[in-house]
């Protein structure tokens, strides 16, 4: 069997909302993956599990099942959304994300994703992790790859 290549492309969009009373930030982050099947037979993308970390704390998890079948020598682009919550001991981040004197409120998030594929009863897992910059101050749609390697503003007292 030839390889199944998984490429994490980046954040496609991030939609933000707040609970003012609890100083909680809700970020719905949609990510894009390219999965390439280099085989001469179809493979099934059985599931995608993803999690997002902020400051070494897991702030969101998602799992997609029975996603798609990728034909021989074919590639599919798959979007998946991870709902994240920045709250409790991290709710001081609300003080940064809702600051109105700056226009971009980039925070560093670590995206982890594991893709499970199956073919002929054989299962294979491919994992990727990548640091991305997401604006926690407004709804943002990104050009693919745009959320990588930006200058990040890190809140400080």
């Amino acid at each position: 069997p030839r390889s199944i290549d998984v490429k994490y492309i980046g954040v496609k969009s991030a939609y933000v909302s707040y609970d003012v009373q609890k100083r909680t930030i809700y970020l719905n982050i949609t990510n894009t993956l390219n999965i390439t099947n280099n085989n001469y037979y179809s493979v099934e993308v059985e599931n995608i599990t993803a999690q997002v970390q902020f400051s070494k704390t897991v702030i969101g998890k998602a799992r997609l099942n029975n996603i798609t079948i990728i034909g021989p020598l074919d590639m599919k682009q798959i979007d998946y959304t991870v709902p994240t919550v920045i709250a409790e001991e991290m709710s001081y981040m609300y003080d940064f994300c809702t600051l109105i004197s700056i226009k971009v409120h980039n925070i560093v998030l670590m995206m982890q994703v594991t893709v499970t594929t199956t073919y002929f009863g054989h299962s294979e897992q491919i994992s990727q992790e990548r640091y991305q910059y997401v604006d926690c101050g407004r709804n943002t749609t990104y050009q693919l790859g745009q959320s990588e390697y930006l200058n990040v503003l890190q809140p400080q007292q």
Epitope: V20, S91, Y92, S101, Q157
Partner: antibody
């Protein structure tokens, strides 16, 4: 120099409404949240409302919902407090106050205050 | 709502001595390392003036004789040495959640 200049004293009849203004200067109006605070004679302070001047999103003390409405006019850098169905309980000095901030975070303390507007409700 | 209880309601302190004002919150007003309590000074006929923000940070232009401390639920404003011009009413305020509330005030008289 940061300045918050409030409108003059008001004497109004019970049941009437009043609109108080707070004209700001010396800073970028849309870069700072604005608050209004009530102080009844000889009493402590009561926070009424906080507003984001960019989009008009206002967050009210539930006690003042239905009593107070906060609006902003970005073109004149002015915040307005509308008080309706006035009773003697609403007689007080009302202050506008800017929410201070550090370079990269809010602190929610009020660093600059208007001189206050006295509202007296009497028949 | 979070209630802030200030004590004493009034105090008289001799010139050059220390004035200590307490503020107790009905529940914690801290998140992580940040404490959302602020102190104001108000003189008759004037608006309040910010002295201390986030429990212990001195506002720009405020004399160093003012200091704030505390975290969680118990906070203190210290003035040392007290000067004549410090005669005023002092308020604590929290901003941990909505609605923000103020303490009842402490009236400081200079002897």
């Amino acid at each position: 120099e940061v300045r918050l200049q409030q409108s003059g004293p008001e004497l109004v009849k019970p049941g009437a409404s009043v609109k108080i203004s707070c004209k700001t200067s010396g800073y970028t109006f849309t870069d700072y949240y604005m608050n209004w605070v009530k102080q009844s004679h000889g009493k402590s302070l009561e926070w009424i409302v906080n507003i984001n001047p960019n989009n008009g999103d206002a967050f009210y003390n539930q006690k003042f919902k239905g009593k107070a409405t906060l609006t902003v006019d970005k073109s004149s850098n002015t915040a307005y407090l509308d008080l309706r169905s006035l009773t003697s309980e609403d007689s007080a000095v009302y202050y506008c106050a800017r929410e201070g901030q550090l370079r990269l975070r809010r602190v929610y303390a009020m660093d600059y205050w208007g001189q206050g507007t006295s509202v007296t409700v009497s028949s | 709502d979070i209630v802030l209880a200030q004590s004493p309601a009034s105090l008289a302190v001799s010139l050059g001595q220390r004035a200590t004002i307490s503020c107790r919150a009905s529940k914690s007003v801290s998140i992580s390392v940040y404490t959302y309590v602020h102190w104001y000074q108000q003189k008759p006929g004037q608006p309040p003036k910010l002295l201390i923000y986030l429990a212990s940070n001195l506002e720009s232009g405020v004399p160093a004789r003012f200091s704030g401390s505390g975290s969680g639920t118990d906070f203190t404003l210290n003035i040392h040495p007290v000067e004549e011009e410090d005669a005023a009413t002092y308020y604590c305020q929290h901003s941990r959640e909505l609605p923000y509330t103020f303490g009842g005030g402490t009236k400081l008289e200079i002897k």
